[in-house]
Amino acid sequence: KSPIFGPQEVSSIEGDSVSITCYYPDTSVNRHTRKYWCRQGASGMCTTLISSNGYLSKEYSGRANLINFPENNTFVINIEQLTQDDTGSYKCGLGTSNRGLSFDVSLEVSQVPELPSDTHVYTKDIGRNVTIECPFKRENAPSKKSLCKKTNQSCELVIDSTEKVNPSYIGRAKLFMKGTDLTVFYVNISHLTHNDAGLYICQAGEGPSADKKNVDLQVLAPEPELLYKDLRSSVTFECDLGREVANEAKYLCRMNKETCDVIINTLGKRDPDFEGRILITPKDDNGRFSVLITGLRKEDAGHYQCGAHSSGLPQEGWPIQTWQLFVNEESTIPNRRSVVKGVTGGSVAIACPYNPKESSSLKYWCRWEGDGNGHCPVLVGTQAQVQEEYEGRLALFDQPGNGTYTVILNQLTTEDAGFYWCLTNGDSRWRTTIELQVAEATREPNLEVTPQNATAVLGETFTVSCHYPCKFYSQEKYWCKWSNKGCHILPSHDEGARQSSVSCDQSSQLVSMTLNPVSKEDEGWYWCGVKQGQTYGETTAIYIAVEERTRGSSHVNPTDANARAKVALEEEVVDSSISEKENKAIPNPGPFANEREIQNVGDQAQENRASGDAGSADGQSRSSSSKHHHHHH
């Protein structure tokens, strides 16, 4: 008795396809060993047609695949464009040779059955409508016209020209004639269901002189489209229901035993399980729409259906489209934290994965908004400026080639809590969802900047220090100047790192940045942060205002400085609209005066400078001759 199980017999018709599922026992060896499908010959030899090792025989080329689902302990053999030559005995099995564990499957492919020559076949999808054409002779023009549906014993009236209508067709069936043509009548039946399928007879007149026509109405449920997606990836259900339902509410539901539970609809309903990771997008006026789900979970696998109805709920007799979604746990998308926690006033560094083969793709970060049909406005991107309300506190750091980019958000408030998506303009499967939770801070922040009311005086020297706790001792500390194109890493000096003693003095750990001499372009947001290699950690931000030296000049408080930053940004946007050329991200040394200084800061500065994105120059035209940042000695 073989532990492999599957269908003993499979029958289909020419031109159609089959999907054969074979079940294997739940063991690690079985999950990873070779799966195969072979055809048994008269000699008892079984010739491999397809295997999970990538082998595909000539006769299956372009029309078959084999997919392993280790999480379900199954593998599926899909074969399309069947011919009668495919009839035969097969085995599905496991093992390095075709003599391993297997199950016998008999496949029979028959010819498409012939119908009597006088039968007209109408093939329609569920929810659609059909117009049946019923010809008759002129002498039957004044007679009663009718359409009836054949049952075992009799022919049950559907509709006739005396306006008699079967109760189950009220509001769905119409009998009419077109123009002055007195040799044909038509019956239209809308909102077709499976129960409408069957044989019909149209008739004009009575008795032996009556005109009759046989009609075979086939009502098809859409064959589910098979979707194979990786765990943590995303899926898009493209739904095309036709223009007759263009103005109806749209929905996507998931089959659950006896019902189809709505996941999302255009009336604002959304399943809480999909909060933060689903969008519904009407495409056009032809009834087309799409539903995008990110961060796929194992439990998302199942049978999905999209449809349209004024209620936004599944309704029999309305058009539908279906999918069978499989979620493969052997995913190429790395397992990242799906929840990131921060505290008010603090910061978060979110590592976003992307397809490493697409390192040059544009990276984005958007915030999922649940209102309406759901949308995800981009907050920052490699070629998208930071949204104004995130000024000074949001930046994207691209690390070309390593399959990750980092988004840092600081000065957190409880308003920032919510769902965010990492996405690129490349492989759409790599869209990932992060939930940001923000709790009220209960202790002092890890990084603190002094002085806190930072007002620098034009032409003078100005130093800011960033104090960090001993736990960050071994991490790389950095200062960067924020612009709406990124945060450009600057040369800085780590006071704590100079100490040769093994002990760590909590009070003396600081990293300083000096502006010498201070210029007007130095005004803006600066970040102090820690990182370990390419992994970014905490950050804190400070706004440095620049004032001319005046007698009795007073410090500007940070809120005024923030207001000024907003004004400055608005002015910059107005200016940049004058000349498109000036607004292009041209890689330039920015605050760095020479190559040596860039190298001193480390690889990150090189990467930032080269990318022209996250770490592109401030967008201010600075002279690099005399004014530059340098180490504080």
Epitope: F5, V10, S11, D16, V18, H194, L220, P224, E258
Partner: nanobody
Framework: EVQLVESGGGLVQTGESLRLSCAAS????????MAWFRQVPGKEREFVAA??????????YSADSVKGRFTISRTSPKGETYLQMNGLKPEDTAVYYC??????????????????WGQGTQVTVSS
């Protein structure tokens, strides 16, 4: 929604035959799996056989214990489902249940995957 009614059970001698029928009323499906399970008091439901209709293709499954003796059939996606039982043995004595699931999902042998069940019909095989 969907009602399943079994018939055809009864008392037979070892080696005789019986034909069970399962009539479905209510909704009609084109993507459907129909199955027969059986249960002996105090034991779990045991898979007997199943048939799937998916588009124009049909898939037939049966348990090792009944292979070559029992045949499941279904005339059309809307027709009745039959279980032809030949060469009956005393160990085939049980209540036989008809089950259905649409759309077709999961392992046909797993009773949890079915969403519609009949009331059952008793089959007794005496020696």
């Amino acid at each position: 929604e969907v009602q399943l009614v079994e018939s055809g059970g009864g008392l037979v001698q070892t080696g005789e035959s019986l034909r069970l029928s399962c009539a479905a009323s209510g909704r009609a499906f084109s993507d459907l799996r129909m199955a027969w399970f059986r249960q002996v008091p105090g034991k779990e439901r045991e898979f007997v056989a199943a048939v799937e209709w998916r588009g124009s293709s049909r898939y037939y499954y049966s348990a090792d214990s009944v292979k070559g003796r029992f045949t499941i059939s279904r005339t059309s996606p809307k027709g009745e489902t039959y279980l032809q039982m030949n060469g009956l043995k005393p160990e085939d004595t049980a209540v036989y249940y008809c089950a259905a699931v649409s759309p077709v999902v999961g392992d046909p042998r797993n009773s949890d995957t079915y969403n519609y069940w009949g009331q059952g019909t008793q089959v007794t095989v005496s020696s």
